[in-house]
Each structure stands twice: as structure tokens, then as C-alpha cells.
Amino acid sequence: ILGGREAEAHARPYMASVQVNGEHLCGGVLVAEQWVLSAAHCLEDAADGKVQVLLGAHSLSQPEPSKRLYDVLRAVPHPDSRPDTIDHDLLLLQLSEKATLGPAVRPLPWQRVDRDVEPGTLCDVAGWGIVSHAGRRPDRLQHVLLPVLDRATCNRRTHHDGAITQRMMCAESNRRDSCKGDSGGPLVCGGVLEGVVTSGSRVCGNRKKPGIYTRVASYAAWIDSVLA
């Protein structure tokens, strides 16, 4: 997260760290007791490493009573996701067992109504992604409030030049932005999960390259079918 601040500890109990061989790789969001939603491209970076999900964490390194690392029983990338595009960049991870819920671990309601968030709406994005262009990684969860950007502006040639489909949404990126390592994390508007950070190699913090988020409401049928 660029231009953000440290989050209040355990105030986002849905927040997950998708880890490979014990290292944070991507963000994720707990959407059901046994399921974490993330970004499909995160799996590509995992190679053959052991994928696990950390829940109940604020600090990645310090011991915390609510922290627990779960093995992944099943990884389900969206069937249409492809390495060369950010389309359908969603991944569902089934935990080896149901998460132990509590004040620091709780699923987040996700948007099912397929309607665009009003441009200008302030939404919260959180993650353990880099906090500087130099690539500094935080130990504690960061967050930032970002205004939603209308799709027409996001599709301008100097922005994303037509690449933003109806199944994506954008947020402003003027110094405050999601960045590398935040992919798969939640964009939360009005207490509801609206978007998932896409995992492209996009430049961060440049206002002409807005953050791109996969709209979960557009994938309600797929999410329901996997969770069923």
C-alpha cells in the first residue's frame, strides 16, 4: 500500500495473507468459514511452493493470539483466467478446515448486486504489499482510502486504454495506491467487499495508471458454484 498508514490491529478480521513457503505473497479475503478469495495470478508466482493462508494477523512476524496458518485443501482459479491478461483474475482457496472465527477472524459480506459503485465513493484497500517504490515491505497491515474512478476515465488512452471491462472497477492512484504484494486483497466500500486487487505489473502511485480491481458482484454465480 503506497501513501497509506498502519491499520488498526485486527479491525479487518476478514484480511488474509496468502503465503508461499512461509513468505507473504498476496492478500486475500475470508468470504466464508472455509474459503478465501484472492487473485488468480498469485498462483503463478507460487510455482511449486507450499501455499498456506494466514488469518487473524496484524503483524506478519510477531506472535499474536489470533494468528493461525491454514493449509490449502483446494485452489480454484477462475476457469477463464489467463497468464497474459488481468481478466477474471480471481482465485478461491479452500482451507484445510473451517477457520476458527472470533473478533479477529470473520468473513466479509461480498457484493452480489451487479451494479457499479458510484464514482467518488471512498473505499478501503488493505494489504502487506510494498509501501515504497524502493520495494520496502511492511510487517504490519497497511490500509488506504481510495476514491472509485469512473470507467470511462480509467479507459482513456493515457490511463488503461480500453482494457477495463464491465467486470473490473478502478480506484484513483495519485500517490495513494495498492501495489505489489497487495494483489488478491479486498477493496471494501461501505463495509461490503466490492473488488479484489488485480495482480498485474502495473506501475503504482501514478495518477494516470489507476488501480484495477476485479468486481466480485460480476462473479457471484461462479463464487456461489465453487462455495456450494
Epitope: 469512473d150 493515457t158 486504454d161 464491465q166
Partner: antibody
């Protein structure tokens, strides 16, 4: 399939105004800016300006400020350009073109002829 | 305003020839985001312009690979490796980096 269907040719008198339309189909109208381009007979292309269909926000080439006014009607997915105080120098083909994938999609053009 | 100067204005060719069109901008068209929004369009008589190349060297979908774009900063080139009859028309370079957006005067590709 993306289509931009423009209104038909116009023959107008000097000093009058004209409003030409560009109806979009095959995509969500509010997802892309609409731009307008002028081409005088046998000449090059000139960018007039653009409009954001979400909020009606516009940007104009200084040369066309006071000459062209861009508007949209979201309910009919139609962009409009009004040209006022017409002179013979405004006789041209006017194109609408969608931004996003550069200017990959163009209307067929509307010929405006200014003559007494 | 950024002036886009194309040369030549007329380019007589035989079918199968290589053709090269130059476009020079009056100032750098590298955008503040680091990208260069230089595009090439082809307009055939009685038709709307059609996009060929965007961001200097990227062919738009469906554009044959005999078309290639190159250049940087202020100097850009469009090359057609083997001219076919369907390639005849007027070619325009365009910059989308600075407002007002501007086109070159056009290069007419015609048969000798």
C-alpha cells in the same frame, strides 16, 4: 460489435447552428469517452474535443471553444455536437470516435455544408 | 500545440515495394506517465480513418504484420514491408499525449 451511427448530412445557412448526433451501440456507453474530429474537404483531421458520458465533463481544443458544444444523452447512448455561428470554414465532415483502444472505432461521418 | 510533420506528403509506390513514412513532432510526446501515445491511421477514400498502430509500435488487432511502427521522442516511422493494393490511401500520424490532440497533414500512398 461496436458501432457509432452518425446523423445524416446537413445543409445550413451562414450564421445558423446545427446539432449532429452519434448513437453508440455494442458497448456500454458510459465506459468510454467520446471524441469529435473535423475533416475539411481534402484536408487533414483536427481534434475538436471530448466528453465523459458519465458526468458530461468536456475538454476542448482552444480553436473550437465557442464554436462546438458537446453533450450526451445517457438514456439513448447518444453523443451530440452542436456547432454555432456557422461560416463556410465550418463546412466539413465531422466524425465521432470512441476513446479506449486508442481511436479504434469511428462513426461514418456527418457532412455539414454551410451555404447561402 | 504539438505540430506533427509528415514526410513525404505523397508517396508513389509499386505493389510489392517497401514504403516508409516519417512523422516528426515539434516537441517530445512522451507522456508524464512514461508512455508515448503516437498512433497511425489509414483513411481510404470515402471512409472513416482506421487505427493501424498505437503507442508507437503496437499493431491493432487484425492489422497485417507487414505494417510496423518505430521511433521515440520526436521521430517516428511507419513501414509497410510489401505494399498491397488495399494499403493505398492517406496515412495520418497522431499524438495523444498532449492536449490538444493533433494529427499530421497526411501522406498519400498511391500507385506510380
Amino acid at each position: 460489435e461496436v458501432q457509432l451511427q452518425q446523423s445524416g448530412p446537413e445543409l445550413v445557412k451562414p450564421g445558423a447552428s446545427v446539432k449532429i448526433s452519434c448513437k453508440a451501440s455494442g458497448y456500454t456507453f458510459t465506459d468510454h469517452y467520446m471524441n469529435w474530429v473535423k475533416q475539411s474537404h481534402g484536408k487533414s483531421l483536427e481534434w475538436i474535443g471530448d466528453i465523459n458520458p458519465n458526468n458530461g465533463g468536456t475538454s476542448y481544443n482552444q480553436k473550437f471553444k465557442g464554436k462546438a458544444t458537446l453533450t450526451v444523452d445517457k438514456s439513448s447512448s447518444t453523443a451530440y455536437m452542436e456547432l454555432r455561428s456557422l461560416t463556410s470554414g465550418d463546412s466539413a465532415v465531422y466524425y465521432c470516435t470512441r476513446e479506449g483502444a486508442s481511436f479504434a472505432f469511428w462513426g461514418q461521418g456527418t457532412l455539414v455544408t454551410v451555404s447561402a | 500545440d504539438v505540430l506533427m510533420t509528415q514526410t513525404p506528403l505523397s508517396l508513389p509506390v509499386s505493389l510489392g515495394d517497401q514504403a516508409s513514412i516519417s512523422c516528426r513532432s515539434s516537441q517530445s510526446i512522451v507522456h508524464s506517465n512514461g508512455d508515448t501515445y503516437l498512433e497511425w491511421y489509414l483513411q481510404k477514400p470515402g471512409q472513416s480513418p482506421k487505427l493501424l498502430i498505437y503507442k508507437v509500435s503496437n499493431r491493432f488487432s487484425g492489422v497485417p504484420d507487414r505494417f510496423s511502427g518505430s521511433g521515440s521522442g520526436t521521430d517516428f516511422t511507419l513501414k509497410i514491408s510489401r505494399v498491397e493494393a488495399e494499403d493505398l490511401g492517406v496515412y495520418y500520424c497522431f499524438q495523444g499525449s498532449h492536449v490538444p490532440l493533433t494529427f499530421g497533414a497526411g501522406t498519400k500512398l498511391e500507385l506510380k
